[in-house]
Interface confidence: medium
């Protein structure tokens, strides 16, 4: 790993995966196990992230890149680079300090994470409730009562047909 001396910073020629070793007169030494340097010219290697406990390894640490973690089943990532794992709840629940709690009446959560959100207020758009909301699903708003008068026609275009066996991307 010895490299030719540059006239500028003597460390600039050390590639990723090495560090400019102060203790060895600034030769490029390989990063030791469980450490990495992702850019060239570094004077130190960074300690690899360890995916322990509720974290599991998504990508192993290498000499040039840090490990990447995700969460074990029943948990989901929060924060940049999955810095935290938060417990999953069922649909129709939200996570509180005391654990998973059912959504209050008038709110719903259609995911395993996040908070319960209020049902849509159809009347604000001059519409009526077509399908009632549940803890897991929002209400479905329908046409306003006026639109339901005899002779009124729906202006909603038909949904495009899908090929059988294909799920939406």
């Amino acid at each position: 790993f010895e490299r030719t001396r540059s006239l500028q910073d003597p460390c600039s020629n050390c590639p990723a995966g090495t560090f400019c070793d102060n203790n060895r007169n600034q030769i490029c030494s390989p990063c030791p196990p469980n450490s990495f340097s992702s850019a060239g010219g570094q004077r130190t290697c960074d300690i690899c992230r360890q995916c322990k406990g509720v974290f599991r390894t998504r990508k192993e640490c290498s000499s040039t890149s840090n490990a990447e973690c995700d969460c074990t089943p029943g948990f989901h990532c929060l924060g940049a680079g999955c810095s935290m794992c938060e417990q999953d709840c069922k649909q129709g629940q939200e996570l509180t300090k005391k654990g998973c709690k059912d959504c209050c009446f008038g709110t719903f959560n259609d995911q395993k994470r996040g908070i319960c959100r209020p049902w849509t207020n159809c009347s604000l758009d001059g519409k009526s409730v077509l399908v009632n909301g549940t803890k897991e699903r929002d209400v479905v708003c329908g046409p306003s009562p006026a639109d339901l008068s005899p002779g009124a026609s729906s202006v909603t275009p038909p949904a495009p047909a899908r090929e059988p066996g294909h799920s939406p991307q």
């Epitope: 560090f19 102060n22 203790n23 060895r24 007169n25 600034q26 030791p32 450490s35 004077r43 960074d46």
Partner: antibody, heavy 122, light 107 residues
């Protein structure tokens, strides 16, 4: 846990060389630098040199180049510093201390021995 | 060799006061500066590494700052147990050097 064990004191006759020991435990001895540091009474810290046990690579402070010689015995996880031709000027506490060898802690010394008090006197 | 100069040589402060210790390098050492605390009759202990990183277990009243040639150790609220000598050292050059130390007394 990491420990660096040093004898508490050494009484040395002027001119008679002395070999100070530093026994390491609680970590992989070969992958951390061992530094030696001198502290005279009421004074600051003076870096003598360091050694990498894996291959016995050494660095010395020029001031101590002819005074101190650093060695290791990997089989017993022990580092040694031999002081040659000691005079009263060499009376001091001598510390061995561990330093991470990969720069991850910016070459800081993270563990220190208790120090050996060397008295050079006839 | 890189020379590290600490100031003041000694100081006497009261419990609860904010304390600032200075360390100057004779040339640019980046952030490769450590601070050590040495209590009477004890060996030094690492407080700060990389100029500003607090070593695990060190109380958060100790803060390091600075880069290049000027470095500072701050104790936000002095405690009686902080009576000690404080040393800075550089690891930028493979020839390590330490400052002369600052002796901190409690009034």
């Amino acid at each position: 846990q990491v420990q660096l064990q040093q004898p508490g004191a050494e009484l040395v006759r002027p001119g008679a060389s002395v070999k100070l020991s530093c026994k390491a435990s609680g970590y992989t001895f070969t992958t951390y630098w061992i530094n030696w540091v001198r502290q005279r009474p009421g004074q600051g810290l003076e870096w003598i040199g360091n050694i990498y046990p894996s291959d016995s690579y050494t660095n010395y402070n020029q001031k101590f180049k002819d005074k101190a010689s650093l060695t290791v015995d990997k089989s017993s996880n022990t580092a040694y510093m031999q002081l040659s031709s000691p005079t009263s000027e060499d009376s001091a506490v001598y510390y061995c201390a561990r330093e991470a060898g990969d720069g991850t802690h910016y070459y800081a010394i993270d563990y220190w021995g208790q120090g050996t008090s060397v008295t050079v006197s006839s | 060799n890189i020379v590290m100069t600490q100031s003041p040589k000694s100081m006497s402060m009261s419990v609860g006061e904010r304390v600032t210790l200075s360390c100057k390098a004779s040339e640019n050492v980046g952030t490769y500066v450590s601070w050590y605390q040495q209590k009477p009759e004890q060996s030094p202990k690492l407080l700060i590494y990389g100029a500003s990183n607090r070593y695990p277990g060190v109380p958060d009243r100790f803060t390091g700052s600075g880069s290049a040639t000027d470095f500072t150790l701050t104790i936000s609220s002095l405690q009686a147990e902080d009576l000690a000598d404080y040393h800075c050292g550089q690891g930028y050059s493979y020839l390590r050097t330490f400052g002369g130390g600052t002796n901190l007394e409690i009034k």
